[in-house]
């Protein structure tokens, strides 16, 4: 990480593991006011690599609900509506940060956790390996 | 959120804004050991809606580096390599959580922030609005 000079106006931390444990304000600031997230809401259906969204719920995690994309087909949908196996539908995955309650069930103590989620699907040309 | 009973083995919080401010262990636990994230590393190039990845860096944020996808074309790439404008390349966006240093430059005090990132692109059938 980047070394940041200690500022006298900062909250103090007596934690012996500092800087591993920090204070986090859960009053979320949303920077997406200018963007309409609904804009992409029907891409899952209109895509040539359409996907379904599955609800993944875990009360020990923040956010507790995460939506996981699952590609509908192994191939991609052509203009005539048929599935073409010359192309492949694949999930686009992203590593995201979540907060995991630790110890379990504790309301005010968390650990950062990285999880891999499938956000949607895209249509790719397969890598073809022919038998000699 | 879900109400979770107070557990006597939990760290105590004297913060008057509790439960808005919590302790977070930054020693990240990575749950993705079973998945090979490299699997999707070339999708950006092989997709019919290829994208470029732009580095977004902010030292006041954790993680400080986020990669943003930008679709290369307005249309989608056909099997012959030409761009088909009857179809549209669109970004798949996801809201993710990041930690924002607050007050600024403080190493041990953060606020949760939601930001919208483009993870990759997918090829969709356009919505055609005919003139009456």
């Amino acid at each position: 990480g980047i070394a940041i000079p200690r500022n006298s106006g900062c909250p103090n931390s007596e934690d012996k593991n500092f800087p591993r444990t920090v204070m986090v304000n859960l009053n979320i600031h949303n920077r997406n006011t200018s963007t309409n997230p609904k804009r992409s809401s029907d891409y899952y259906n209109r895509s040539t690599s359409p996907w379904n969204l599955h609800r993944n719920e875990d009360p020990e995690r923040y956010p507790s609900v995460i939506w996981e994309a699952k590609c509908r087909h192994l191939g991609c949908v052509k203009a005539d509506g048929n599935v073409d196996y010359h192309m492949n539908s694949v999930p686009i995955q992203q590593e995201i940060l979540v907060l995991r309650r630790e110890p379990r069930h504790c309301p005010n103590s968390f650990r950062l956790e990285k999880i891999l989620v499938s956000v949607g699907c895209t249509c790719v040309t397969p890598i073809v390996h022919h038998v000699a | 959120g879900i109400a979770i009973p107070r557990n006597s083995g939990c760290p105590n919080s004297e913060d008057k804004n509790f439960p808005r401010t919590v302790m977070v262990n930054l020693n990240i636990h990575n749950r993705n050991t079973s998945t090979n994230p490299k699997r999707s590393s070339d999708y950006y190039n092989r997709s019919t809606s290829p994208w470029n990845l732009h580095r977004n860096e902010d030292p006041e944020r954790y993680p400080s580096v986020i990669w943003e996808a930008k679709c290369r074309h307005l249309g989608c790439v056909k099997a012959d390599g030409n761009v088909d404008y009857h179809m549209n390349s669109v970004p798949i966006q996801q809201e993710i959580l990041v930690l924002r240093r607050e007050p600024r430059h403080c190493p041990n005090s953060f606020r949760l922030e939601k930001i919208l990132v483009s993870v990759g692109c997918t090829c969709v059938t356009p919505i055609v609005h005919h003139v009456a």
Epitope: P50, N52, K70, C71, R72, H73, L74, V77, G81, N82, V83, Y85, H86, N88, S89, V90, P91, V124, P126, I127, V128, H129, H130, V131 | N36, R39, Y43, R46
Partner: antibody, heavy 120, light 111 residues
Framework: DVQVQESGPGLVKPSQSLSLTCTVT?????????WNWIRQFPGNKLEWMGY???????SYNPSLKSRISITRDTSKNQFFLQLNSVTTEDTATYYC?????????????WGQGTSVTVSS | IIVMTQTPLSLPVSLGDQASISCRSS???????????LHWYLQKPGQSPKLLIY???NRFSGVPDRFSGSGSGTDFTLKISRVEAEDLGVYFC????????FGGGTKLEIK
């Protein structure tokens, strides 16, 4: 338990159309499965013909593409095969089958099959 | 179209013996998502095929553990550790990574 049952004429004349119906019980055809038609020629050779998925998307064997159509009637929980311009080469046992279409993409339940002979 | 080649065509075995059937595809069966969609079926005389193994090595529900699948890329094997009378019939490999295709079948019969 899921059951799939084929029905249709056992004899079709050359150049005519073959129409078969598959009736599904114990499973909605709009849940996460693909509903396949597969045929077996005399001598055991199996050929995948095509499917219609839970969302109504179809996929066909490229060798049959110009002659085949698979449709469905969700209210009756049935799906259908139409094969046009048949020849004696289309004589086979025709199976309808369910494919687990959410993860394994394998046919997990087959009907008993219906024998179709193409002859004048 | 992917061609699936099974060997042998016929496999005479004694009950209790191990049996091994090979299946080779004309192209790699690894999908871009990393999975390999290679499956095995058994068709007993007068019956429709039944799923035994899916995605190379996973036994379908109710399939005895004497059946096992292995392989990768283009070469796959089905093994039966101790053949029983109820195992006799025609075994087919199949792939669904590309347009689905089947192997020609291997007839398991008593020696």
């Amino acid at each position: 338990d899921v059951q799939v049952q084929e029905s249709g004429p056992g004899l079709v004349k050359p150049s005519q159309s073959l129409s078969l119906t598959c009736t599904v019980t114990g499973n909605s055809i709009t849940s996460y499965y693909a509903w396949n038609w597969i045929r077996q020629f005399p001598g055991n050779k199996l050929e995948w013909m095509g499917y219609i998925t839970y969302s109504g998307t179809t996929s066909y064997n490229p060798s049959l593409k110009s002659r085949i159509s698979i449709t469905r009637d969700t209210s009756k929980n049935q799906f259908f095969l139409q094969l046009n311009s048949v020849t004696t080469e289309d004589t086979a046992t025709y199976y309808c089958a369910r494919e687990e279409y959410d993860d394994i993409y394998a046919v997990d339940y087959w009907g008993q099959g219906t024998s179709v002979t193409v002859s004048s | 179209i992917i061609v699936m080649t099974q060997t042998p065509l016929s496999l005479p075995v004694s009950l209790g013996d191990q049996a091994s059937i090979s299946c080779r595809s004309s192209q790699s069966l690894v999908h871009s998502n990393g999975n390999t969609y290679l499956h095995w079926y058994l068709q007993k005389p007068g019956q429709s095929p039944k799923l035994l193994i899916y995605k190379v090595y996973n036994r379908f529900s109710g399939v005895p553990d004497r059946f096992s699948g292995s392989g990768s890329g283009t070469d796959f094997t089905l093994k039966i550790s101790r053949v029983e009378a109820e195992d006799l019939g025609v075994y087919f490999c199949s792939q669904s990574t590309h347009f689905p295709t089947f192997g020609g079948g291997t007839k398991l019969e008593i020696k």
